[in-house]
């Protein structure tokens, strides 16, 4: 059957057919964007909506981690008829809307990237006028942050039976390979631990037993560069202590 009705919200003549297109939004985001730590990245997001010429109030939102429930990192609101989206939230002041939501573009610029920004981001738009509707991308865009290695900690710690061990922790993306060098060692990839859960860019390497006094150097390397740091071991012979 075909029935004609007046749609009061848009004051248009509609034809309602027995099977009609569902009111659906669509969002276009790339699967991944890559950038180096310290640089800026653009997260593209465009959308289509089923509401012809919406000119009412709107809110643009970006969240991180997971869709619908992850923490918001950016939010702006545009008044009826306005093309200016006033920023209400920009986490650490590093997020800025590049796109124009009135033109179906929610693209976001992220400044001063850090490895901690490496996660998935989800764009969302909300209409709040005569039309009350909203949409959020389920897939999101993965921001892949790359970084040259940086040694974040190097230390010598006591072990049982008056022995000593050395630990070196570095961060980078891709995760760096760690190598120790030192007295009677040559180059050693000694006991590299897997990146710790929740710290995916950190890698730790341990030298389980330091047998000689002298300088021990940890080198971290990945495709973007290398970094090194050293510790010195001097044991007071005849005493149980050591100077590092």
């Amino acid at each position: 059957f075909v029935r004609t009705k007046i749609d009061t919200t848009e004051n248009l003549l509609n034809t309602e057919v027995h099977s009609s297109p569902a009111q659906r939004w669509s969002m276009q985001v790339p699967p991944e964007v890559s950038a180096e730590a310290g640089d800026a990245a653009v997260l593209p997001c465009t959308f289509t909506h089923p509401h012809r010429h919406y000119d009412g109030p709107l809110t643009a939102i970006w969240r991180a981690g997971e869709p619908y429930a992850g923490p918001q990192v950016f939010r702006c609101a545009a008044a009826r008829g306005s093309e200016l989206c006033q920023t209400a939230l920009s986490l650490h002041g590093r997020f800025r809307l590049l796109g124009n939501p009135r033109r179906n573009d929610l693209s976001l610029r992220v400044e001063r990237l850090a490895l901690a920004d490496d996660r998935r981001y989800f764009c969302r738009v909300e209409f709040a006028g005569d039309v009350h509707d909203r949409y959020e991308s389920r897939h999101g865009v993965r921001l892949h942050v790359t970084a040259a290695p940086r040694i974040v900690n190097i230390s010598v710690l006591p072990s049982p039976a008056h022995a000593f061990r050395a630990l070196c922790t570095a961060e980078g993306e891709p995760p760096p390979a760690l190598a120790w060098s030192g007295p009677a060692l040559g180059n050693s990839l000694a006991a590299v631990r897997s990146p710790r859960e929740g710290h995916g860019h950190l890698v730790t390497a341990e030298l389980p037993a330091l047998t000689h006094d002298g300088r021990y150097t940890c080198t971290a390397a990945n495709s973007l560069g290398r970094s090194e740091a050293s510790v010195y071991l001097f044991r007071f012979h005849g005493a149980s202590g050591a100077s590092t």
Partner: antibody
């Protein structure tokens, strides 16, 4: 975690009205999405009946439009199905389900069985 | 309404086999926004349906990668590589591109 739970009378007489409740926990029905009723007849055929959106607007299957109503109580985070003038053909297991923006039902209730008999 | 026709009605398999289920719609379910809202659900005895695949080929979270979906226009396929015991049940295709939304009649995956 999001959970949906249907409840209803189990038995209804022909020509009477059927009222079912879906109680949602772990998510506000006014936050997002469309909240649907779907039924499964003996023999396993599934039929989508309609939904109420987060905004309160409704969409129904055209062939049911004259006797279906989906409403909600936002204070209790519940939505309801009313089906008037039931016949034995309405005997089925009734499910409520959350429909996400991409047209997928990601959370379902466990279903409540309704028998229409005199 | 958009009629969704599934074949076969019943699909006897041995564990470890590949399985393929077909779903055909009576009209195109390509939405005007460019997406195709074709989903696959699995219903095990005594349970509600569970989502496997959405928008033709996207695996829902937690769904093993032995499930894959493909197709376009009016012809769609669900493939299961290496069937496991937990995969047994009734599979339904579903279209959400047109109102009213409609389900296929179901395909029962069972042990030979």
């Amino acid at each position: 975690d999001v959970q949906l739970q249907e409840s209803g009378p189990g038995l209804v007489k022909p020509s009477q009205s059927l009222s079912l409740t879906c109680t949602v926990t772990g998510y506000s029905i006014t936050s997002d999405f469309a909240w649907n009723w779907i039924r499964q007849f003996p023999g396993n055929k599934l039929e989508w009946m309609g939904y109420i959106r987060f905004s309160g607007s409704t969409t129904y299957k055209p062939t049911l439009k004259s006797r279906i109503s989906i409403t909600r109580d936002t204070s209790k985070n519940q939505f309801f199905l009313q089906l008037n003038s039931v016949t034995t053909e309405d005997s089925a297991t009734y499910y409520c389900a959350r429909e996400d923006y991409d047209g997928l039902f990601d959370y379902w209730g466990q279903g409540t069985t309704l028998t229409v008999t005199s | 309404d958009v009629l969704m026709t599934q074949t076969p009605l019943s699909l006897p398999v041995s564990l470890g086999d590949h399985a393929s289920i077909s779903c055909r719609s009576s009209q195109t379910i390509l939405h005007s926004n460019g997406n195709t809202y074709l989903d696959w659900y699995l219903q095990k005895p005594g349970q509600s349906p569970k989502l496997l695949i959405y928008k033709v080929s996207n695996r829902f979270s937690g769904v093993p990668d032995r499930f894959s979906g493909s197709g376009s226009g009016t012809d769609f396929t669900l493939k299961i590589s290496r069937v496991e015991a937990e995969d047994l049940g009734v599979y339904y295709c579903f279209q959400g591109s047109h109102v009213p939304y409609t389900f296929g009649g179901g395909t029962k995956l069972e042990i030979k």
